[in-house]
């Protein structure tokens, strides 16, 4: 889900079970021989399997957890062949005579097998044939196999947890994006579709959840009566990296679908007696039958089961059936979680609901249109989640947590567009690349800019159409242009200025976005290909000579205009942004448009002064967008910095959560600039000032702190103004957080902060405070029962000025026992974001590099998120040779799926150098006019 | 190489219960197919049951489904076959043979090493 899926399957150490046949010699691999190629032949498809699996949830003689399984695949031939190419990843196959036995199905006669090998490079098992196998026919290969059961979050893995001082067990399944052949052989790719027969032999106090729900009831295994046999109905025809299942003690709350679906959510016993449950189960039928809706098709399978795992390394994942979730984007406890945590949860919900048509009913043929599938997902969710809480606004949302978070990576020159041809994906590291900010957010930006442009009924009878021609099969990105054209050729009031195709070619196959910019007094409009360091050079051609098919919307003096293309051209004239003198205009209304606004400067004057007087005249999230736009156009040197900074005035007026958050994210990267310099106490001074009525308006709405505001905005609003107020120094606020934090410490049975608070208080107070409240707050972390409430405390712990306190925190990451292994980079990343912690935890990346690549690898350690957050405030020529030293000093090791984001670093840090040097004179000079 | 040792026959009651067990030596049987057969005097060797290099394969005579059972721990690389309600007609000496292969068959021929085998007798 989102940004969380850190699904990286590369560097994993093989797992030290009884040896197997491996070819190596990486480099002088034959390419002529399929087995030496990532991508399968289409020799032979897969048509079912039957696939028995036994985990082992305790150690066997050499201390290792296993599983053990057997696999039936059933073939089909398409074209003569004497080798079967199927994946397998770190299994172990016998030793004794061929891995596998092959058998023809009905008349077919099958050839011998000369010898079976393993090749550890492409994560094949490969079977030569003494003769070949005939098109049309059928054959069975069947094999069994071991593999290790390990705590690396990828294929089948074991996830521990305690209850009380008991260490529970649980053998749970991630296989997206290339893991499910590390569970049993198979054609692992999602075109390879079959039906898949899952049978769980697990121990009999235990159950067993898989994709189906079972056939009848579990029985007892002949040979041992302490296991049991659950046999599940065969799945519909669907992708490899959509499979599922799990044994575990876990209990679940129910409930059945009007449509006759059961709905069940599952979690810790100790989770669901305390209700934890509950919020998710109230929200997944509404969601369930809104999509049913929204995509004219009904939910595709008998039962939809959510489950809430203790370690789980992306935020969910979709499989068909049986969703998994890390806890916190399933758990809400009303007791101890907060607004955004709840928010989290349906959202999440929303996300991975929407999956269960477009991306498992309907697949993208291969991982380079991963953006299509995790893009639209990451729409919808919105809408999803919308229509369970439809007093939330959640739709305005996209815009500060897609839209504008992906442009200030989409404007940099080392972007990439989000259609990557499929030759260019082959690998599982080149897989893994995918799943990025680009793919998720800037899919999900341009999708919903398409809906708009379409409107949604539109959108919803192509996307209908598109679901039931492709059900139970595989596309491309073009098959729902096509189906969307067809849907606006059926109709006249809807014209567009070219095809689909055309139009969204433009915002698919080439990197960035246009800014684009009115002259007011002409009405003249131009675009251009808006990159925040104007003087970097961009490597990468496009076809279309960056030029975009923009729809612009617009509002002049409050009222709304007429709806205009800009075709591909850099220029053009409209009188609707033609304005007297005393007049303004505003484009993108609602940011419905992936692209940023540029006016001349009396425009950009009259607006600020329409905010100052009346803002409530240009709509909310423009009023965020004003702010988001003239500071990235003041990084790109396109207007003055002093004028974004004015754009900041009108907020001493503002109570909306959206035009804030703008301010404190736009800021944000000021305050990382320069919090170690002159500039940072002005700058704190400004934003007291500023914030002050604010907190005072939430100080008298909740009563003293003591209520919390009605709507979802209001109280996200309202952690602002505390988060805010404490860390830029108003006293009031620093003396609210030391009080209730010792309070708590006083009793710390009955936290009398609020859960939308913690976060905030927790770290306003470790930050005013020493050890005692560090290490109060660390042994809440050890016995809190909840994973949000954890979260809060793990980030807060961060927050402390103590350096040896930082420290000591910064090796908890690497103990498994203290840190949880999907919790470390978020950690190491929490103590970066805090000005004293970020040289230590800079530091401390470059001393562990090796042994955070080699112990984390699998999965469970996002290194693009982790080179991110150490090097964010990275703006000085030392830092800059430091961080190429880095790269040096580590080229044998690598850099996994933090390749990109290291490259992105150098360039962020060049960039940081040339605007503190331009801006930190000017910016200094107008906080201390302005505080 | 791989030594093979039964143990555990006897003589019981019909309608009693055996436990036989294959101990493995010199090498490890882990990755092999196991099997028990059985000749009664006279009598060709027959397959009784056999089990795969996982246990997650399981094949029976016809004769004994439902009443013995194969089972191996390889930890102690032994192999067993529970014998419940035994018959006169399961009087025999019991074979353990290992498979070249970690796939399960019914033939004797694809079984390349063998115990000495145990007698089980079953009389009243």
């Known amino acids: 889900y989102a940004q969380e899926k850190n699904k990286n399957a590369e560097h994993v150490p093989q797992a030290p079970t009884s040896p197997t046949i491996t070819t190596t010699a990486a480099i002088t691999l034959d390419q002529s021989k399929p087995w030496n190629r990532y991508r399968l032949p289409t020799t032979l498809l897969p048509d079912s399997y039957n696939v028995t699996l036994r985990p082992y949830l305790t150690p066997n003689a050499d201390g290792l957890y296993i599983f053990k399984g057997k696999s039936i695949v059933r073939l089909l031939c398409q074209e003569p062949t004497d080798v079967i190419i199927i994946h397998s990843k770190k299994l172990n196959y016998t030793t004794q005579g061929h891995m596998v036995v092959l058998r023809g199905v009905g008349d077919s006669q099958v050839p011998e097998i000369d010898r079976t090998e393993l090749v550890e490079l492409t994560e094949y098992l490969v079977v030569h044939l003494k003769g070949s196998l005939q098109p049309g026919h059928m054959y069975e290969m069947e094999s069994e196999f071991q593999g290790e059961l390990a705590d690396d979050l990828a294929g089948f893995y074991r996830s521990e947890y305690m209850e009380g001082n008991v260490k529970k067990v649980l053998a749970t399944t991630q296989m997206q994006s290339t893991d499910a052949r590390k569970s049993f052989p198979c054609f692992d790719e999602p075109a390879m579709k079959a039906t898949f027969n899952i049978t769980l032999i697990h121990p009999n106090n235990l159950t067993a959840l898989s994709n189906m729900p079972p056939k009848g009831s579990s029985t007892p295994l002949a040979e041992d009566p302490n296991w049991s046999v659950t046999e599940f109905e065969t799945t519909p025809v669907m992708s490899t990296y959509l499979l599922a299942y799990i044994v575990s003690e876990f209990q679940s709350v129910n409930e059945t679908a009007q449509n006759g679906v059961l709905i069940r959510i599952w979690a810790r016993p100790n989770a669901i007696a305390e209700g934890h449950g509950m919020y998710a189960l109230n929200v997944t039928g509404p969601i369930l039958n809104f999509f049913a809706n929204h995509y004219n098709t009904s939910y595709p399978l008998p039962k939809s089961d959510q489950i809430a795992l203790p370690d789980f390394n992306a935020g969910a994942m979709e499989n068909w059936g049986l969703v998994t979730y890390r806890e916190n984007a399933l758990l809400f406890d009303p007791q101890s979680s907060s607004i955004s945590n709840k928010e989290r949860v349906v959202t999440v919900i929303a996300h991975e609901l929407a999956h269960q048509w477009f991306g498992n009913l309907v697949t993208l043929a291969w991982w380079n249109d991963l953006w299509l599938n995790e893009g639209f997902a990451s729409y919808v969710e919105y809408l999803g989640a919308d229509h369970a809480e439809p007093t939330w606004n959640l739709k305005d949302l996209i815009v500060p947590g897609d839209v504008y978070r992906v442009m200030a990576v989409d404007a940099l020159a080392s972007s990439h567009p989000l259609t990557t041809p499929a030759e260019e994906v082959n690998t599982p590291a080149q897989i893994s690349e995918m799943f990025d900010s680009i793919s998720y957010s800037k899919g999900a930006s341009v999708i919903r800019m398409l809906s708009n442009f379409l409107t949604e009924d539109l959108f919803k009878e192509g996307l209908a159409s598109y679901l039931h021609a492709f059900a139970y099969q595989n596309t491309t990105y073009l098959d729902l242009w096509e189906h969307l054209q067809k849907a606006v050729d059926a109709q006249t009031s809807i014209r567009l200025p070219d095809t689909v195709r055309a139009i969204m070619d433009r915002w698919t196959l080439q990197m960035g976005f246009p800014v684009i910019t009115v002259d007011t007094k002409t009405g003249n409009i131009s675009q251009k290909h808006f990159l925040l360091d104007s003087e970097s050079n961009v490597t990468r051609s496009s076809a279309f000579d960056y030029l975009w098919i923009v729809p612009i919307s617009s509002i002049k003096n409050g009222v709304m205009q007429d709806h205009y293309w800009l075709r591909d051209v850099s220029q053009a004239q409209n009188d609707l942004f033609k304005t007297a003198s005393d007049d303004w205009v505003l484009l993108n209304v609602n940011v419905t448009g992936y692209f940023q606004v540029n006016y001349d400067e009396d425009n950009w004057r009259m607006i600020q002064h329409q905010l100052q007087t009346n803002l409530s005249v240009i709509p909310v999230i423009n009023r965020a967008q004003v702010i988001y736009d003239s500071f990235n156009l003041a990084t790109a040197h396109m207007v003055p910095v002093t004028l974004a900074l004015d754009n900041t005035l009108f907020l001493n007026g503002e109570k909306e959560y959206m035009p804030w958050q703008a301010a404190l994210s736009s800021l944000s990267y000021f305050s990382l600039m320069f919090d170690r310099s002159e500039v940072y106490g002005p700058m704190k001074k400004y934003l007291r000032k500023q914030v002050e009525p604010l907190f005072q308006h939430f100080e008298t709405l909740t009563k003293n702190w003591t209520e919390r505001p009605e709507n979802l905005m209001d109280q996200y609003s309202e952690i602002n103004a505390i988060s805010t107020a404490c860390s830029n120094g108003l006293p009031q606020c620093e003396n609210l957080a030391k009080t209730l934090f010792d309070q708590w410490m006083s009793d710390p049975e009955n936290n009398p902060i609020h859960p939308n608070l913690r976060s905030t208080i927790y770290c306003n107070a470790i930050a005013q405070g020493g050890q005692d409240q560090w290490d109060f707050a660390w042994g809440q972390l050890q016995q809190a029962q909840l994973v949000n409430e954890a979260d809060k405390l793990r980030s807060a712990l961060a927050c402390s000025n103590e350096v040896w306190l930082l420290n000591r925190y910064l090796g908890y990451t690497l103990n498994p026992d203290l840190i949880r292994k999907q919790d470390a980079t978020s950690t190491i990343n929490s103590i970066a974001s805090n000005v004293i912690g970020q040289p230590l935890a800079w530091d401390f990346v470059q001393s562990n590099w090796k042994k955070l690549f080699q112990d984390y690898g699998g999965g469970s350690f996002s290194f693009s998120n982790l080179i991110q957050g150490v090097t964010r405030r990275f703006s000085s020529e030392f830092e800059l040779q430091q961080l190429e030293q880095f790269k040096k000093n580590n080229m044998d090791v690598g850099f996994g799926s933090g390749t990109r984001a290291l490259e992105q670093a150098l360039e962020k840090t060049k960039a940081n150098i040339k605007w503190v040097k331009e801006n930190k004179e000017v910016v200094l000079n107008w906080f201390i006019e302005h505080s | 190489q791989v030594q093979l040792q039964e143990s555990g026959g006897g003589l019981v009651q019909p309608g009693g219960s055996l436990r036989l067990s294959c101990a493995g030596s010199?090498?490890?049987?882990?990755?092999?197919?196991m099997g028990w057969f059985r000749q009664a005097p006279g009598k060709e060797r027959e397959f009784v049951a056999a089990?795969?290099?996982?246990?997650?394969?399981?094949n029976y005579a016809d004769s004994v489904k439902g009443r013995f059972f194969i089972s191996r721990d390889d930890a102690e690389n032994t192999v067993y076959l529970q014998m419940n309600s035994l018959k006169p007609e399961d009087t025999a000496v019991y074979y353990c043979?290992?498979?070249?292969?970690?796939?399960?068959?019914?033939?004797?021929?694809?079984?390349?090493?063998w115990g000495q085998g145990t007698q089980v007798t079953v009389s009243s």
């Open positions: 043979a290992a498979r070249q292969s970690g796939y399960v068959s019914k033939f004797v021929d694809d079984y390349g090493y």
């Open positions: 089990i795969s290099w996982t246990g997650l394969t399981t």
């Open positions: 010199g090498r490890t049987i882990s990755n092999h197919a």
